[in-house]
Interface confidence: low
């Protein structure tokens, strides 16, 4: 049945998919408090533009009975379960805010009719890449294949002098689900990362990695995982590591490694961390006052739906456009809007663009130091420290394999 | 100017093996990955398989035990040979360049080796 | 392995007509749904790709459209230069696979 949207004569309404099942273990009330602070921005802001109009948002919670897992795995039904509970409400917004997880926002594409544009907090997965109406706004797993492509093709930097072309990937099946998505995306036979490698194993055991370390018959010095540094302590203990092992860490949304006490442990000496380069304002705001740092970009990002959706509706409003056209549903993309935090690019199909960072550990201070950076956006990398500190003989990465001449 | 040129025997004996070399032009292989694909009247297109542009292969389950794709990035040529042939491997064999991640299309193809496997 | 199928295997219009090429996949392809011409000299040309994209240098009577499982070709108004075979090519996963191929002739 068609459902009408709460979306004109100057009312406009948000739909904020309440899930039990998200991609990150967020109480919901901060949620709410993120998208409520969002409100009150964006009515601001309108009302700056001489918009006299109302916005308000619609919480939408699932029962919470059937759904109950608390993580993504029994996500798909409860998206189509909560779109169905708003059909019967015959009551939608001009946006839908949420779901965040893979499965979920793939089968509510999949099954509705999408004449509104969907935000999400997450949805990380290769399957929904593309999706004309969708905006994601956490870095999806695409754009972190393209980083590492990029990485690994690089050899003319004076830290890094070889091209690569191979990888071990560790995915043991009880990642997060950032990090389920960034693994499963590089274990995929069909993705960018699989297609531009020589060789790419995967390591599925803890003891397959144990093993690595040292093997001198290993087909590749290079090993991605995904977790914190607590997570790789766990796993590799104090054990001894070759030499030429680099380990690439991908800790996204993260930003303890910014913080000013903060000392690396001597285990992260062989490490490389991939991390995305710290907000300023956020540590101050109201709603993030009682978040983890991993957690503190899950709100943001539904903080920063609410504003992209109030910068479309600004645009829209002011050009005396209707916001309850296929127009508008596609407009959420290959854009810049004002975010909490400073500017946000969303690229052509409507993914967040970022500046990812490359961490290394310092002999010399046993800080974490920025080793580069890389633009997501322009798919460029910028190289911050020409003489790092590295635990690597003279201090440059080595090769991928060992035994490998200059190329 | 992108282009593949295809070079290879006309006519193979059965049981032996089929050569053909693919030489690119325009484009690097460093870059794309080159596709083989054949056309028979009685199976139409098969796809048989792919050398991507970091080395690494992956070739049609139907066709793996006899199939071995390479390539010599710097001469710019891409090697296919199939094995133990018979009667009805007589096609069209055609080489093709990959598109443009994440799409999965042959973005530009050879003009095919027409070859026939008889005694 | 995903099965694509063309159940028109010939198709006769006339010039200045509407042609309408149909693909059938196995099972929902997400929109990974190319399109080629062959001519009969056997050559072969991308004309569109991910259902609705339209190669470079493609003329603007060529279009696409489908999701889930159909798909079609559209040449919106036919010229002699379009007699040839259409091929559509699954690229959701491998290994890929071809549709049977229609042949277009004019009356």
């Known amino acids: 049945s068609q459902v009408s949207q709460n979306c004109h004569n100057g009312s406009y309404e948000i739909s904020v998919l309440m899930m039990g099942n998200s991609a990150f273990a967020e109480p919901l009330k901060n949620l709410e408090d993120a998208v409520n602070e969002g409100l009150e921005i964006v009515r601001g802001r309108l009302q700056n533009a001489g918009l006299n109009v109302t916005v308000n948002a619609t919480f939408m919670y699932s029962d919470g009975l059937i759904h109950n897992s608390g993580d993504c795995r029994s996500s798909t039904c409860e998206g189509l379960d909560l779109l169905r509970k708003i059909s019967n409400a015959q009551r939608m917004g001009c946006v839908l805010i949420g779901p965040s997880c893979t499965y979920s926002t793939f089968q509510m594409y999949l099954d509705t009719e999408l004449s509104y544009p969907m935000i999400s907090a997450g949805s990380f997965g290769l399957s929904c890449d593309y999706k004309e109406t969708l905006t994601r706004l956490m870095s999806p797993a695409r754009k972190l294949m393209y980083f590492l492509v990029n990485f690994w093709k690089t050899n003319d930097l004076p830290f890094k002098t070889y091209s690569w072309s191979t990888s071990y990937v560790y995915k043991n099946g009880t990642e997060t689900e950032d990090c389920f998505w960034y693994l499963n995306a590089l274990e995929a036979s069909v993705s960018y990362f699989s297609h531009e490698l020589g060789f790419k194993v995967v390591l599925r055991q803890d003891k397959e990695f144990q093993d690595i370390l040292m093997d001198h018959n290993r087909k590749s010095n290079v090993i991605i995982m995904c977790g914190g540094p607590e997570f790789l302590y766990k796993l590799k203990g104090d054990r001894a590591v070759a030499e030429d092992i680099v380990i690439i860490l991908v800790d996204l949304f993260n930003d303890q490694y910014f913080e000013d006490n903060v000392t690396a442990p001597d285990y992260m000496k062989n490490v490389l961390v991939l991390t995305l380069s710290p907000g300023n304002s956020l540590l101050n705001s109201s709603f993030s006052r009682n978040l983890s740092p991993t957690k503190r970009d899950f709100a943001l990002a539904y903080l920063n739906g609410i504003l992209l959706f109030g910068h479309m509706l600004k645009i829209f409003l002011e050009n005396g456009e209707n916001i309850t056209t296929p127009k508008f549903a596609h407009a959420f993309r290959n854009l810049t809007f004002e975010g909490y935090d400073g500017p946000v690019t969303l690229d052509d199909w409507g993914d967040v663009d970022s500046t990812m960072v490359l961490l290394y550990t310092s002999v010399d201070t046993k800080k974490y130091k920025v080793l580069l950076t890389y633009d997501t956006h322009v798919n460029k990398t910028y190289p911050v420290d020409m003489s790092p500190t590295f635990t690597w003989k003279n201090s440059k990465l080595p090769n991928d394999i060992t035994g490998r001449g200059p190329q | 100017q992108v282009q593949l040129k295809q070079s290879g025997p006309g006519l193979v004996q059965p049981s032996q093996s089929l050569s053909i070399t693919c030489t690119v032009s325009g484009f690097s292989l460093t870059n794309y990955g080159v596709h083989w694909v054949r056309q028979s009247p009685g199976k139409g297109l098969e796809w048989l398989g792919v050398?991507?542009?970091?080395?690494?292969?992956d070739y049609n389950a139907a066709f793996i035990s006899r199939l071995n794709i390479t390539k010599d990035n710097s001469k710019s040529q891409v090697f296919f040979t199939m094995n133990s042939l018979h009667s009805d491997d007589t096609a069209i064999y055609y080489c093709?360049?990959?598109?443009?991640?994440?799409?999965?299309?042959?973005?530009?193809w050879g003009a095919g080796t027409s070859v026939t496997i008889s005694s | 392995d995903i099965q694509m199928t063309q159940t028109t295997s010939s198709l006769s219009a006339s010039l200045g007509d509407r042609v309408t090429i149909s693909c059938r996949a196995s099972q929902d392809i997400s929109n990974y749904l190319n399109w080629y011409q062959q001519k009969p000299d056997g050559t072969f040309k991308l004309l569109v790709y991910y259902t609705s994209r339209l190669q470079s240098g493609v003329p603007s009577r060529f279009s696409g459209s489908g999701s889930g499982t159909l798909y079609s070709l559209t040449i919106s108004t036919l010229e002699q230069e379009d007699v040839a075979t259409y091929f559509c090519q699954q690229g959701k996963t491998l290994p890929f696979s071809f549709g049977g191929g229609t042949r277009l002739e004019i009356k």
């Open positions: 050398i991507w542009s970091g080395g690494r292969k």
């Open positions: 093709a360049r990959h598109g443009t991640y994440p799409y999965w299309y042959f973005a530009l």
